[in-house]
């Protein structure tokens, strides 16, 4: 009786595997001792003419590693649209604006990247801006998360190495589809599916946890998950189904916080792992995946239990010529408002990159046409003209883009929130009833925060985008909310107030604050007109006194 089975590529529609990794084709991490500014350099290599990238910067929360000032250099070989997120820190971006296009204007200082040809020249130039903290070269990334702040265990010099594991400093998700294989196990009755993930050893062997997220939408009650990795890998498993789990090392399961389960010895070959699945009565290996050393793996199986299907031989086709993408073109249209004027500036180079030919750009009132400058089409109007619709807090219009004859025009609704008509305030409370505001917080005591917007309005929705507590030069920057998610177990996003004001609570542990001090609580608010998805941001802050429990005056 055959133990193994012939693994075949799986039709990608049946499931997908995505992962994030810290391994880059070339890179290094260093600690920039006593540097006021840390410099990070990203070399991005894209295969296609136009790519999309999500780039997120995260501020470090480790003691003594407060992020002071950051200089980020982005070097791309091709055109790339960047969706950018960063905490409220002094940030400088250097990039070639003819290649790198940011969706929305990042709220940062921008430096033009000089025309340098070699990586060495770019690195020499970057070194004049501050101490280089990280360098990474990435092949076709889809998303990157860069952790700011110093790594005290890193060397003092950043010397790029091939196939470098960037550790906690950088995680990225490749765009390339991970090959998934599958096979039937002959001679096994019943229907039990096996999902096998094999992590290959990396260049650096240090203890690490791999998070495995698995989402199955099948109707079979029976499944097995087999995870094999190098001896230094333990696993954190987040799955929506109950199933048998077999792993090397040690694992814990999200639904049981704090659980630890000892793994077992597993064979180190694909066929050996398949044999283990057979021992557990699996009748089909629904997905077999081999990956480099990763941080997170997400496995989605959308049609498990259906007819077993492998991918047909690829058919060679000629890709269609790139044509103007309305979606990307629309994303370039971002209104800016202030002093009772709405302005839109469309970068002509970016329009060209998208291979779009525009013959006109107007507001709803077509007599209000864009002005053609050297490098931009600029459409501007006071709130009182060009068909602007003005309500208590929102100003709206419609932008019409015309193309050469034969193509219908594109229309996009644009809106601005009239910031001058709204006021925002942070309130700190010591009980979940949000009755009496305070400006003093005791270490170890739960604090409750509410963002109040006045006057009350249903026209604008407010969300907490990020919040942090700056404990001054002696202390750390404590990230409380990042990317609309509570950071750590001490922070909880609460239900909004009856009026819709965002609320959250946090617990300031004693070890987070070296000595009783004052701090600044800052929140970045994402404001959105209720009829549109485009957001604007507003930062609100308040000063806090932080006292030790014994100094609080409580008897």
């Amino acid at each position: 009786e055959r133990v193994g089975c012939d693994l075949q590529p799986v039709d990608p529609t049946r499931g997908e595997v995505t992962f994030t990794t810290s391994q880059v084709s070339e890179g290094c991490v260093a600690q920039a001792a006593n540097a006021v500014r840390e410099v990070h350099v990203l070399f991005l290599d894209f295969p296609g003419m136009l790519s999309h990238l999500e780039l997120t910067l995260q501020a470090s929360k480790q003691n003594g590693t407060e992020t002071q000032e950051v200089f980020l250099v982005l070097v791309s070989n091709k055109n790339v649209f960047v969706k950018f997120q960063a905490p409220e820190i002094p940030l400088h971006l250097a990039y070639d604006s003819s290649l790198v296009i940011f969706q929305g204007q990042p709220r940062v200082n921008i430096t033009v990247l000089p025309s340098l040809t070699s990586r060495k020249q770019i690195l020499d130039w970057a070194a004049t801006k501050g101490a280089i903290t990280s360098i990474a070269a990435l092949d076709d990334p889809q998303s990157i998360v860069l952790q700011l702040g110093q790594d005290p265990k890193a060397p003092f010099l950043c010397l790029p190495e091939a196939h470098k594991d960037m550790g906690a400093t950088l995680e990225w998700q490749p765009r390339a589809q991970t090959p998934v294989q599958s096979c039937r196990l002959e001679g096994v009755s019943g229907h039990k599916e096996a999902y096998i993930l094999r992590i290959l050893p990396g260049s650096e062997a240090g203890p690490r946890t791999v998070t495995v997220m698995m989402e199955l939408s099948c109707t079979s009650g029976d499944a097995i998950l087999i995870l094999h990795g190098p001896p230094y890998v333990s696993w954190f498993i987040d799955i929506n189904h109950s199933m048998q789990i077999l792993t090397t090392g040690e694992y814990s399961v999200k639904i049981f916080p704090g659980s630890k389960v000892k793994g077992v010895e597993l064979p180190d070959t694909p066929q050996g792992l398949i044999a283990e699945a057979r021992k557990l009565n699996a009748s089909i290996v629904t997905s077999f995946v081999e990956l480099p050393l990763v941080s997170n793996v997400s496995l989605r199986a959308s049609s498990c239990g259906g007819v077993f299907q492998t991918t047909p031989a690829p058919v060679v086709t000629t890709p269609p010529k790139d044509t103007c993408s309305p979606v990307l073109l629309m994303s370039l249209i971002q209104p800016k408002c202030g002093n009772q004027v709405m302005t839109l500036a469309l970068n002509k180079k970016h329009v060209q990159t998208l291979q779009c030919t525009i013959t006109g750009l107007t507001f709803w009132d077509s007599s209000c046409q864009a002005e053609d400058t050297d490098d931009h089409l600029v459409l501007s109007s006071a709130y009182s003209s060009c068909g602007m619709k003005v309500t208590a807090h929102v100003v709206s219009n419609e932008v019409i883009i015309s193309f050469p004859s034969g193509s219908p025009p594109l229309r996009k609704k644009v809106q601005c929130i009239d910031m001058d008509s709204l006021s925002f305030q942070l309130g700190l409370y010591l009980s979940p009833h949000f009755l009496q505001a305070s400006n003093t917080i005791e270490l170890g005591q739960q604090a409750f925060v509410q963002v109040s917007v006045s006057p009350l309005t249903s026209e604008v929705t407010v969300q907490l985008d990020s919040c942090h507590l700056d404990l001054g030069p002696e202390g750390d920057m404590v990230e409380l909310i990042q990317s609309r998610t509570a950071k750590g177990s001490c922070v909880t996003l609460l239900s909004p107030s009856p009026e819709g004001d965002p609320r959250f609570s946090f617990l300031l542990r004693v070890y987070m604050v070296p000595t009783p001090t004052a701090g600044t609580l800052s929140c970045n608010l994402a404001l959105r007109p209720s009829t549109l998805s485009q957001e604007v941001y507003k930062t609100v802050s308040m000063r806090l006194n932080i006292v030790s429990p014994d100094l609080s005056g409580k008897g």
Epitope: C218, G221, S242, V261, K262, V264
Partner: antibody
Framework: QVQLQQSGAELVKPGSSVKISCKAS????????MHWIKQQPGNGLEWIGW????????KYNQKFNGKATLTADKSSSTAYMQLSSLTSEDSAVYFC????FGVGDYWGQGVMVTVSS | DTVLTQSPALAVSPGERVSISCRAS??????MHWYQQKPGQQPKLLIY???NLASGVPARFSGSGSGTDFTLTIDPVEADDTATYFC?????????FGAGTKLELK
């Protein structure tokens, strides 16, 4: 807090069917399995099966195939077990228990089913 | 089916340490769980996946073992621990319970 409230005791005739309910509160009903367990006096505990309300997946102890049918109503966060062709052997206390990976972390108070003519 | 064998009864004095064993007829990985049941009540989870203490359970209770031999330990035993203790495995189909160990206090 997590609570599983089971329906009241049942006195039923042999050959008939009974449907008992288990109303969940205090957690996301669709994120956990709901297990059903039988306990006869002096006979210990017997696992009947589980249902995953998230997508209706079920897994049965083969011994109860055809005897027990597990269903769940997401809108009311209620799990049901129907027992059919009842005999005196089915007289027992039936528990529902919230679970994952076969662990029953919260249990209902139990429903006494008595089959008697 | 996987048969779980428990000793039927134990009698100990308060303050002592007691170990209740559960042996499986075949390997169950680490998927052994322990429950406490008092007369007229539903079972209560004490230990899950061999050694993990369930929420709200005193640290006097601990679990150990893997493969086929598992132990529930109570140290020290208190008067309130008088109950029947069941082991349960959820690795092999169908899931099965032990017959229970009745713990009495002297």
């Amino acid at each position: 807090q997590v609570q599983l409230q089971q329906s009241g005791a049942e006195l039923v005739k042999p050959g008939s069917s009974v449907k008992i309910s288990c109303k969940a509160s205090g957690y996301t009903f669709t994120s956990y399995d709901m297990h059903w367990i039988k306990q006869q006096p002096g006979n210990g505990l017997e696992w009947i099966g589980w249902i995953y309300p998230g997508n209706g997946n079920t897994k049965y102890n083969q011994k109860f195939n055809g005897k027990a049918t597990l269903t769940a109503d997401k809108s009311s966060s209620t799990a049901y077990m129907q027992l059919s062709s009842l005999t005196s052997e089915d007289s027992a206390v039936y528990f529902c228990a919230r679970g994952k990976f076969g662990v029953g972390d919260y249990w209902g108070q139990g429903v006494m089913v008595t089959v008697s003519s | 089916d996987t048969v779980l064998t428990q000793s039927p009864a134990l009698a100990v004095s308060p303050g002592e340490r007691v170990s209740i064993s559960c042996r499986a007829s075949e390997g169950v990985n680490s998927y052994m769980h322990w429950y406490q049941q008092k007369p007229g009540q539903q079972p209560k989870l004490l230990i899950y996946i061999a050694s993990n203490l369930a929420s709200g359970v005193p640290a006097r209770f601990s679990g150990s073992g893997s493969g086929t031999d598992f132990t529930l330990t109570i140290d020290p035993v208190e008067a309130d621990d008088t109950a029947t203790y069941f082991c349960q495995q959820s690795w092999n189909d169908p899931y099965t319970f032990g017959a229970g160990t009745k713990l009495e206090l002297k």
